[in-house]
Amino acid sequence: SERCDDWGLDTMRQIQVFEDEPARIKCPLFEHFLKFNYSTAHSAGLTLIWYWTRQDRDLEEPINFRLPENRISKEKDVLWFRPTLLNDTGNYTCMLRNTTYCSKVAFPLEVVQKDSCFNSPMKLPVHKLYIEYGIQRITCPNVDGYFPSSVKPTITWYMGCYKIQNFNNVIPEGMNLSFLIALISNNGNYTCVVTYPENGRTFHLTRTLTVKVVGSPKNAVPPVIHSPNDHVVYEKEPGEELLIPCTVYFSFLMDSRNEVWWTIDGKKPDDITIDVTINESISHSRTEDETRTQILSIKKVTSEDLKRSYVCHARSAKGEVAKAAKVKQKVPAPRYTVELACGFGAT
């Protein structure tokens, strides 16, 4: 066959859909690979062709669009399942072509089963709510385009297995679920079940997302360096191991990059010749505030090393801070005979 621009298997778009529910899948070519949309392609005389490879098979085969009740159909750049079956799992390819042009991309489609409590292998989107931040809403995701605006679906919300009704601070409002005041105890999986009629049949769309309650921007502060501090002096003799922890607290900030680093005499440890190692550990609070500890270690410290400046730096979207560690050489205790001699005025 003639050459075709093959974008390969687009595993970034691992599409998961529930068994026995409608699914509408847009050809990824127009969303991620080509610089024009379906309407432009169609009016230029290009045709969109769909085919698939079943799970654990190598054979590409056409999609059967002549199933009873049009179970699988294509509408513009969308492949429709009304509804899906478990054995629809496989790699689907959409190809755009005419006599002179060809472009195609494949993507995996996985039809997954759920239990009565909506547990499944589905990867769940995470929605972060700010703690105690006033009314916040989550919206039932990915239901656009399934039914016209004239159709009024029924929506039922669940937390885990339980229908949300008479919850103190969580109120279902159609496609939205309102949290009057988000608390840690609101963490969990929330499911909306959208039920709508179509051509005398009733379909259900199930969408589950994970709610994670995180620190509020109202409480956010610049990084706080707890160690090193002014109360601790790192007093060492040459040959001993020098260990200095830098412990920094970062408020949760959406999309902020938290950084901690050491400088020695104003340089990054990688840029100096001394044998220094840095180990980092990270812990999180219940609201995803972060405490990072970087321990600077010099196995056998020299008297030169004990004269250097060791500074811990931290940066987040809220600001940058730095704190120097107090490092000094231990003064050896005077020898007894010398001390006595000095005491008697000897020089």
Epitope: G215, H226, R286
Partner: antibody
């Protein structure tokens, strides 16, 4: 008005287990976290762990992790804390406490259950 | 683990006096999730203050909380006879949840 009612005092032998119950009355139970806190005689308060009944999410303090089991029965509005391999230093009053409706602080406490571990 | 250190261990005051109790954390308290509890002998603890400075339902306004980060204070503006008890601070923002060792407020 929500109340937390705990089971009665227990006397246990070292090495055995104890299961303390905490029943909520007069309000919604399953959507709030129920935590367990203990207090040895003349000592301060020590958090042991907690559960959110509706999701079954449970977590506990490291020093109890291998000995504690926290469960909840939504049908009876009751939370349970079972502590195994008891030793004399587990002698304490065990409290259950509810996270609040408008905050995550412990706003309602049970009356406490005295557990004595003695041979 | 966040360690909470309360001071003083004991506070001897007379009714009508002002009490200032301190609670210091080894690390910043997440989301200002710091609470104060009162415990009278033979009773369960009672929530006084949550979120550093918010009074719990039914708590008189002579109790107030303040602070941020690692340093927190509970103030009782005028001690009443029923206020003589043990007071605990607690952080509930990071697991494990931890309590301070307590401050006993006793009658002078």
């Amino acid at each position: 008005q929500v109340q937390l009612l705990q089971s009665g005092a227990e006397v246990k032998k070292p090495g055995s287990s104890v299961k303390v119950s905490c029943r909520a009355s007069g309000g919604t139970f399953s959507i709030y976290a129920i935590d367990w806190v203990r207090q040895a005689p003349g000592q301060g308060l020590e958090w042991m762990g907690g559960i959110i009944p509706i999701s079954g999410t449970e977590n506990s303090a490291q020093n109890f992790q291998d000995r504690i089991t926290i469960t909840a029965d939504k049908s009876t509005n009751t939370a349970y804390m079972e502590l195994s391999s008891l030793r004399s230093e587990d002698t304490a009053v065990y409290y259950c406490a509810r996270n609040g409706a408008t905050s995550d602080a412990f706003d309602i406490w049970g009356q406490g259950t005295m557990v004595t571990v003695s041979s | 683990e966040i360690v909470l250190t309360q001071s003083p261990g004991t506070l001897s005051l007379s009714p009508g006096e002002r009490a200032t109790l301190s609670c210091r954390a080894s690390l910043s308290v997440s989301s200002n999730y710091l609470a104060w509890f009162q415990q009278r002998p033979g009773q369960a603890p009672r929530l006084l203050i949550y979120g550093v400075s918010r009074r719990a339902t039914g708590i008189p306004d002579r109790f107030s909380g303040s602070g941020s980060g690692t340093d927190f204070t509970l103030t009782i503006s005028r001690l009443e006879p029923e206020d003589f008890a043990v007071y605990y601070c607690q952080q509930y923002g990071s697991s494990p949840l931890t309590f301070g060792g307590g401050t006993k407020v006793e009658i002078k």
